[in-house]
């Protein structure tokens, strides 16, 4: 059983961006590794937005591997026990505790590269990732608050006389909708169990010299504008246009 479609679904145009699989990383270049890291910064926490379905590489502090005793990645995902991936240099052994997601792995052998990779980022990868490096000089941390981004599907249609509806469907986080010119608007958002948010804005323009209206959708993955001509007769079809 599904749900019936909206009873006033005069859909004029749908616009959706498609992103090819890409990789993103906040890692430093090898040249930036410094022996004086402890004097610069002992702990770094970064908020990192990453688009869904891309690959992400998370890096440890820039400590030379020869100075290493233990590397531990601590992964805290919503509603799950903390997962740890550890590598002990002396015995050249790795150990995992409570780690069930096979898409989160070491980039390569941890004795060669301490970075962590997430292959094909999903909404469930939202969370906190921390690398802890134990060295003779002390412990060094780098943490990432990973925020998974989903591009919303944007639609604009006229559903009644001088009333237009703009929707940003299934985005993460919620998109922001604004109108030019401003009208008498009601905007609402709803949260879905897949972690995305739909924002719907319904606007009415009483002033009859307003003939074309623009819906502007702002989102962390990019902005989008659609415009539509307001028709005097409800139900008459006219295409929304993408800027």
């Amino acid at each position: 059983e599904g749900a019936a479609q909206p009873n006033n679904s005069l859909m004029l145009q749908t616009s959706k961006e498609n992103h090819a699989l890409a990789s993103s990383s906040l890692c430093m270049d090898e040249k930036q590794i410094t022996q004086n890291y402890s004097k610069v910064l002992a702990e770094v926490n970064t908020s990192w937005p990453v688009k869904m379905a891309t690959n992400a590489v998370l890096c440890c502090p820039p400590i030379a591997l020869r100075n290493l005793i233990i590397i531990t990645w601590e992964i805290i995902l919503r509603g799950q026990p903390s997962c740890t991936k550890a590598y002990k240099k002396e015995t050249n052994e790795t150990k995992e505790t409570n780690c069930t997601d096979e898409r989160i792995t070491w980039v390569s052998r941890p004795d060669q590269n301490s970075d962590l990779q997430i292959r094909t980022v999903a909404i469930t990868h939202d969370g906190y990732y921390r690398c802890i490096m134990v060295t003779p000089d002390g412990n060094f941390h780098r943490g990432y608050h990973l925020q998974v981004l989903v591009t919303p599907e944007v639609t604009l249609f006229q559903n009644r006389n001088r009333t237009a509806v703009c929707k940003a469907v299934a985005g993460k986080p919620a998109a922001h909708i604004s109108w030019i010119p401003e009208g008498d608007c009601a905007t609402k958002q709803e949260y879905w169990s897949n972690g995305t948010v739909t924002v719907k804005s319904t606007c009415h323009w009483e002033v009859h010299n307003v003939s074309t209206v623009t819906c502007h959708v702002s989102h962390l993955t990019g902005n989008k504008s659609l415009y539509i001509e307001l028709l005097p007769v409800p139900g008459a079809k006219k295409s929304a246009k993408l800027y």
């Epitope: 006033n8 919503r78 949260y191 169990s193 897949n194 319904t202």
Partner: antibody, heavy 119, light 108 residues
Framework: QVQLQQPGAELVKPGAPVKLSCKAS????????MNWVKQRPGRGLEWIGR????????HYNQKFKDKATLTVDKSSSTAYIQLTSLTSEDSAVYYC????????????WGQGTLVTVSA | ENVLTQSPAIMSASPGEKVTMTCSAR?????MHWYQQKSRTSPKLWIY???KLASGVPGRFSGSGSGNSYSLTISSMEAEDVATYYC???????????FGGGTKLEIK
């Protein structure tokens, strides 16, 4: 504060229709969806459908699309559900509930109206 | 439509006892929400986004899970926790809100 007021009970004859009301106060009606949920005695919760008061867009659970019709009167800030051709299977508590805020699901509920279908 | 199956349907616990109830989703979801309904009252949003407690919910409640399996836990049962608990999820394609069948929690 947010309030959704529903009458306590309705007695309806089999085959007859009934229209239940849900009066909203303490918030802007057009900024939220109004949902209706059915609960038969001793049973679980079933989502019937919802209406957007700003433009009367409706969505229905397929199971109830021929049974229920949702409407809204913005001037009185009241949402309605009309149930047709009632049978004993329709005897239940019907709740209105608000969705569409910064919380998922239904953060605010009415007290429910008990509909009893009896000759 | 995603089907949510709760177990057990009925359970009882002594005061101070740890209580765990589960909700299994036929299709994987990223978040699960829970409602508490006491006898002859409206349901209340109790836990949302899998593990966040709604306003006024005691700290002895917690939620966890991922994918197809979620749970609600009470660390130490109290008399006021007697109620029916429903898991809940909403999907936007097609639009549908679904409740689990409920777990009725009684006190010994």
């Amino acid at each position: 504060q947010v309030q959704l007021q529903q009458p306590g009970a309705e007695l309806v004859k089999p085959g007859a229709p009934v229209k239940l009301s849900c009066k909203a106060s303490g918030f802007t009606l057009t900024s939220y969806w109004m949902n209706w949920v059915k609960q038969r005695p001793g049973r679980g919760l079933e989502w019937i459908g919802r209406i957007d008061p700003s433009d009367s867009e409706t969505h229905y659970n397929q199971k109830f699309k021929d049974k229920a019709t949702l409407t809204v009167d913005k001037s009185s800030s009241t949402a309605y559900i009309q149930l047709t051709s009632l049978t004993s299977e329709d005897s239940a508590v019907y709740y209105c509930a608000r969705s569409g805020g910064w919380l998922p699901g239904f953060a605010y509920w009415g007290q429910g109206t008990l509909v009893t279908v009896s000759a | 439509e995603n089907v949510l199956t709760q177990s057990p349907a009925i359970m009882s616990a002594s005061p101070g006892e740890k209580v765990t109830m589960t909700c299994s989703a036929r299709s994987s979801v990223s978040y699960m929400h829970w409602y508490q309904q006491k006898s002859r009252t409206s349901p209340k949003l109790w836990i949302y986004d899998t593990s966040k407690l709604a306003s006024g919910v005691p700290g002895r409640f917690s939620g966890s899970g991922s994918g197809n399996s979620y749970s609600l836990t009470i660390s130490s049962m109290e008399a006021e926790d007697v109620a029916t608990y429903y898991c809940f999820q909403g999907s936007g394609d097609p639009l549908m809100y679904t409740f689990g069948g409920g777990t009725k929690l009684e006190i010994k």
